[in-house]
């Protein structure tokens, strides 16, 4: 079951999922000045048994015949209106991320792929959060939320997560507005950008991945 | 179950010091940030001092800053607030809080009331 | 500091009615607002985060709106239970500040 709105948004930081669950959907989207060949795949979905899973269909991005000044926005899937967006990264693998069933690994990038990843998370689907760079955790260990099914409907769990400027001692944080601030993003972008820079995931974060260190949810 | 329970309030008069405790249980104490929060009586609420799970950092409300000073002993599983030069205006009830992502578990309160 | 202010202070309504409390920002929180509960000599429960997110064991009737510098908590059908104080609180920048409350009474 396709979960129904985005992670959780944490002011100064950002999410990133290291494996995909088996009914993940990517947008096969590309990058201006190209559009998918016309018999291509609206999306890539993530499928398999129980001792592989893998990403069905291949995006494919070819010219566009007739120079397009605006965004190329992709068609979605019916059944889902959100968009969940990650910028473009290169592929990163936790030690144990090949072994975990029912998951898929970081599709590699395709030719002329576009600059964010529009992906449709399935209910279980488990991302993790780190601060922007020049913020820092006031927790420890991984934070992540998890989409779960209750009651019928679909939920994000809160992840444990307050990041504050690492300039800032001895008094609240916020005082000078960094360029990190979600202020920079408009009111109706609901999706969360991943930045360039990779997450440093260490490996106990690996070895959590399905069972967290510490509580995400206390209520 | 989460549970906090504050210690240390009392009545004090202007210019004294009070140190108040929480004692913190059910849930990995070292692993998570805390904070201490104020409510005037039949006042709002605000925001007096944050610490990291590890105590290296530290915030604190310009209202309080240089007179207040939040700690914790993780050993112990215990935060402290050390309040010191109190002022009639921080006569209120000081409550421990967690969770500050996640809805944020709270304790009872302790009353300091700041009076000669 | 971002400076929080509620409205109404108060507001008198009856079991059944549906209520709507507003809080503004002095600049934009970009989402990031909690809504509490509090009852008399109770600690402040949250209601809401992320302006419309429901916290786990909220009633449904509890819902938010909102974005920029202007956000709404809507309760759909007043239920005796729900007669308290409630408190708008922005967590996009440091230091988190609450709004001054509504008390909400019934008529």
């Known amino acids: 079951e396709l979960c129904d709105d985005d992670p959780p948004e944490i002011p100064h930081a950002t999410f990133k999922a290291m494996a995909y669950k088996e009914g993940t959907m990517l947008n096969c989207e590309c990058k201006r000045g190209f559009r998918r060949i016309k018999s291509g795949s609206l999306y890539m979905l993530c499928t398999g048994n129980s001792s592989h899973s893998s990403w069905d269909n291949q995006c494919q991005c070819t010219s566009s015949a007739t120079r397009n000044t605006t965004k190329q926005v992709t068609p979605q899937p019916e059944e889902q209106k959100e968009r969940k967006t990650t910028e473009m990264q290169s592929p990163m693998q936790p030690v144990d991320q090949a072994s975990l069933p029912g998951h898929c690994r970081e599709p590699p990038p395709w030719e002329n792929e576009a600059t964010e990843r529009i992906y449709h998370f399935v209910v279980g689907q488990m991302v993790y959060y780190q601060c922007v760079q020049g913020y820092r955790a006031l927790h420890r260990g991984p934070a992540e939320s998890v989409c779960k099914m209750t009651h019928g409907k679909t939920r994000w769990t809160q992840p444990q997560l307050i990041c504050t400027g690492e300039m800032e001692t001895s008094q609240f944080p916020g005082e000078e507005k960094p360029q990190a601030s979600p202020e920079g993003r408009p009111e109706s972008e609901t999706s969360c950008l991943v930045t360039t820079t990779d997450f440093q995931i260490q490996t106990e974060m690996a070895a959590t991945m399905e069972t967290s260190i510490f509580t995400t949810e206390y209520q | 179950q989460v549970q906090l329970v504050e210690s240390g309030g009392g009545v004090v008069q202007p210019g004294r010091s009070l140190r108040l405790s929480c004692a913190a249980s059910g849930f990995t104490f070292s692993n998570h940030a805390m904070a201490w929060v104020r409510q005037a009586p039949g006042k709002g609420l605000e925001w007096v001092a944050v610490?990291?799970?590890?105590?290296?950092?530290?915030y604190y409300a310009d209202s309080v800053k240089g007179r207040f000073t939040i700690s914790r002993d993780n050993s112990q599983n215990t935060l402290y607030l050390q309040m010191n030069s109190l002022r009639a205006e921080d006569t209120a009830v000081y409550y421990c809080?967690?969770?500050?992502?996640?809805?944020?578990?709270w304790g009872q309160g302790t009353l300091v009331t700041v009076s000669s | 500091d971002i400076q929080m202010t509620q409205s109404p202070s108060s507001l008198s309504a009856s079991v059944g009615d549906r209520v709507t409390i507003t809080c503004r920002a002095s600049q934009s929180v970009s989402k990031f607002l909690n809504w509490y509960q509090q009852k008399p000599g109770k600690a402040p429960r949250r209601l809401i985060y992320g302006t419309n997110s429901l916290q786990s064991g909220v009633p449904s009737r509890f819902s938010g709106s909102g974005s920029g510098t202007d956000y709404t908590l809507t309760i759909s059908s007043l239920q005796p239970e729900d007669f308290a104080t409630y408190y708008c609180?922005?967590?996009?920048?440091?230091?988190?500040?609450f709004g001054q409350g509504t008390k909400l009474e019934i008529k």
């Open positions: 609180q922005q967590y996009n920048s440091w230091p988190w500040t």
């Open positions: 809080t967690t969770g500050l992502n996640s809805g944020y578990d």
């Open positions: 610490i990291s799970y590890d105590g290296s950092n530290k």
